[in-house]
């Protein structure tokens, strides 16, 4: 296993609709054809997997159908979007990149993007 540098923004504020997007960029030392991207969430010293996708270079990222993540790739950059976020989901979201094929296997883990989420103000009841 060889180390690889992964860069991501330090902080992002999610939209009022609970959507946060950020770019995860990795310094690919070779010509990888198969890449796996995993988003981890660290909160209160616990790390949980948010979503993961494996893609072939030049193809779209495919997350599971029920995943809260979507993404696109361009060269050594992955543009990740996480949706359905609520205030309780505020935390550090870490991008993990693995170059699966061809060998050698490379692993890179970013410093994390702190995502802040604000629950929208409830709309006042309106009488018609």
């Amino acid at each position: 296993c060889k180390a690889m540098h992964v860069a991501q923004p330090a902080v992002v504020l999610a939209s009022s609709r609970g959507i946060a997007s950020f770019v995860c960029e990795y310094a690919s030392p070779g010509k990888a054809t198969e890449v796996r991207v995993t988003v981890l969430r660290q909160a209160d010293s616990q790390v949980t997997e948010v979503c993961a996708a494996t893609y072939m270079m030049g193809n779209e990222l495919t997350f599971l159908d029920d995943s809260i993540c979507t993404g696109t790739s361009s060269g050594n950059q992955v543009n990740l979007t996480i949706q359905g976020l609520r205030a309780m989901d505020t935390g550090l979201y870490i991008c993990k990149v693995e170059l699966m094929y061809p060998p050698p296997y490379y692993l890179g883990i970013g410093n994390g993007t702190q995502i802040y989420v604000i629950d929208p103000e409830p709309c006042p009841d309106s009488d018609f």
Partner: antibody
Amino acid sequence: QVQLVQSGAEVKKPGASVKVSCKASGYTFTNYGISWVRQAPGQGLEWMGWISVYNGNTNYAQKLQGRVTMTTDTSTSTAYMELRSLRSDDTAVYYCARGPPTLHYWGQGTLVTVSS
Amino acid sequence: EIVMTQSPATLSLSPGERATLSCRASQSVSSNYLSWYQQKPGQAPRLLIYGASTRATGIPARFSGSGSGTDFTLTISSLQPEDFAVYYCQQDYNLPLTFGGGTKVEIK
């Protein structure tokens, strides 16, 4: 090294607006947020809100909602805070700071005096 | 919103003495998101401690932070003349960011 340099002192009349600038250097501007904090004479620190420079999203303190606007110009790595409908109790030193999380670096402060 | 309460409001001590400042949060705060700042008259606040216990760059070892959950402490092991100032705790675990009301450490 990281530096935040703010615009100079302002004197405004009640009802007017003020726009304070904060020029950042020494780091990748878009990777971090900019918070604005104010301090009335002899008082503590009051967080006004912040802008996520990466995407331009903002979050303001509830008591200032509707009166404050925070923006950035990424081409010049400058953040701006505009406060409208000024009142005498808006007289304070206004600081910009890099963050959250953690306000690691602070500007030198801008004194805004509201007086008729 | 998370309310941060600092005590005491004023601490009167002599140089060389130990200062213990308290900060209490109205709800649990992950220690990664608790900071302490020092402010001297006419100056901007300066970060002392972040992550509840990590000293910022250039901060002397006499400053230490501890605590978790809702109770946090800033300790100055031996007060130097330049340490007499106002100290603020602040959380950015949740929005809005909130500061404590401050503790003034004054010369006795």
